[in-house]
């Protein structure tokens, strides 16, 4: 049987100063059991964008329903972009682990790029 | 229609080992995580374990006695109980994993059940 | 581990009446919450998923409610089929999977 993949569509992403980013990425299977989380950026000093489970997210939101069963469409929303929002952000699959989720497979990314509001 | 059949449960003597064994079948069985979840007599449900692909996951009271594993080109799950104890007694029932919120899951189909007696 | 306090215990409710149980959680586990039904003999059935999800082809007179870590099961006008034993089980924070203690709801 085939691995869980996970797909990020679209390599990069323009998105105007004070706009929404759409940042897209699916999952192939439900398992691994385990969650999906947004990063920014890679390795040790990677910023979390989005972990449904803790924290608090004020300017993302998830495109599908959070109570949708069986879900595989892990993309999300992010508010009111800056450019200091501009970066690469990663899907990444985690498998559950005790005490703690390891990761299992990253998305390719996709690079968000800021245009700045016309003065 | 999603069935589930568990069989394979009896009487055993302490130290003493089974394999139930849950055939599935009306949904894509590969595709979802399964879980034993048992019942001893007159109590309540406890999870046992739980498997996706090649994640597993146990209770405590079972850790490193029991081994749950899957054959997808069976769409059959099992469960290998070793070293048996009186408490092990109950009603083992598969179930199908549901998942919502991104992770975490609950049982949306059970099958019936299958008795183990652990008695000498 | 996360533990679930099913209260009462056992629930006397007349035909037609409410019958409202409760699962408490020992730690918050947002609404990541499921209900289960058991009648004698038989195996346990999904009623409700995500606090407040009815599972498909249960009856609207069951409801949930609640998040954190307290929940309630309401089933508005109690049919003689619903006579049985329900469960919570959360799936916020696992492994393990934990389950309630259970509510019986027997005829008064």
């Known amino acids: 049987e085939e691995e869980l993949q996970v797909i990020q569509p679209d390599k990069s992403v323009l998105v105007a100063a004070g706009e929404t980013a759409t940042l897209r990425c699916t999952a192939t299977s439900l398992i691994p059991v385990g969650p999906i989380q947004w990063f920014r950026g890679a390795g040790p000093g990677r910023e979390l964008i989005y972990n449904q489970k803790e924290g608090h997210f004020p300017r993302v939101t998830t495109v599908s329903d959070l109570t949708k069963r069986n879900n595989m469409d892990f993309s999300i929303r992010i508010g009111n972009i800056t450019p200091a929002d501009a970066g690469t952000y990663y899907c990444v699959k985690f498998r559950k682990g005790s005490p703690d989720d390891v990761e299992f497979k990253s998305g390719a990314g996709t690079e968000l790029s800021v245009r700045a509001k016309p003065s | 229609e999603v069935q589930l059949l568990e069989s394979g449960g009896g009487v055993v003597q302490p130290g003493g080992s089974l394999r139930l064994s849950c055939a599935a079948s009306?949904?894509?069985?590969?595709?979802?995580?399964m879980t034993w979840v048992r019942q001893a007599p007159g109590k309540g449900l406890e999870w046992v374990s739980t498997?996706?692909?090649?994640?597993?996951y146990y209770a405590d009271s079972v850790k490193g006695r029991f081994t749950i594993s899957r054959d997808n080109s069976k769409n059959t799950l099992y469960l290998q109980m070793n070293s048996l104890r009186a408490e092990d007694t109950a009603v083992y029932y598969c179930?199908?994993?549901?998942?919502?919120?991104?992770?975490?899951?609950?049982?949306?189909?059970w099958g019936q059940g299958t008795l183990v007696t652990v008695s000498s | 581990e996360i533990v679930l306090t099913q209260s009462p215990a056992t629930l006397s409710v007349s035909p037609g009446e409410r019958a409202t149980l409760s699962c408490r959680a020992s730690?918050?586990?947002?609404?990541?919450l499921a209900w289960y039904q058991q009648k004698p003999g038989q195996a346990p059935r999904l009623l409700i998923y995500?606090?407040?999800i009815r599972e498909t082809g249960i009856p609207a007179r069951f409801s949930g409610s609640g998040s954190g870590t307290e929940f309630t099961l309401t089933i508005s006008s109690l049919q003689s089929e619903d006579f049985a034993v329900y469960y919570c089980?959360?799936?916020?924070?696992?492994?393990?999977?934990?389950f309630g203690g259970g509510t019986k709801v027997e005829i008064k």
């Open positions: 179930a199908k994993d549901s998942t919502v919120s991104w992770s975490g899951d609950f049982f949306d189909y």
């Open positions: 995500a606090a407040r």
């Open positions: 009306g949904f894509s069985f590969s595709n979802f995580a």
């Open positions: 730690q918050n586990v947002k609404n990541d």
């Open positions: 089980q959360q799936y916020y924070d696992w492994p393990p999977f934990t």
């Open positions: 498997i996706g692909s090649g994640d597993t």
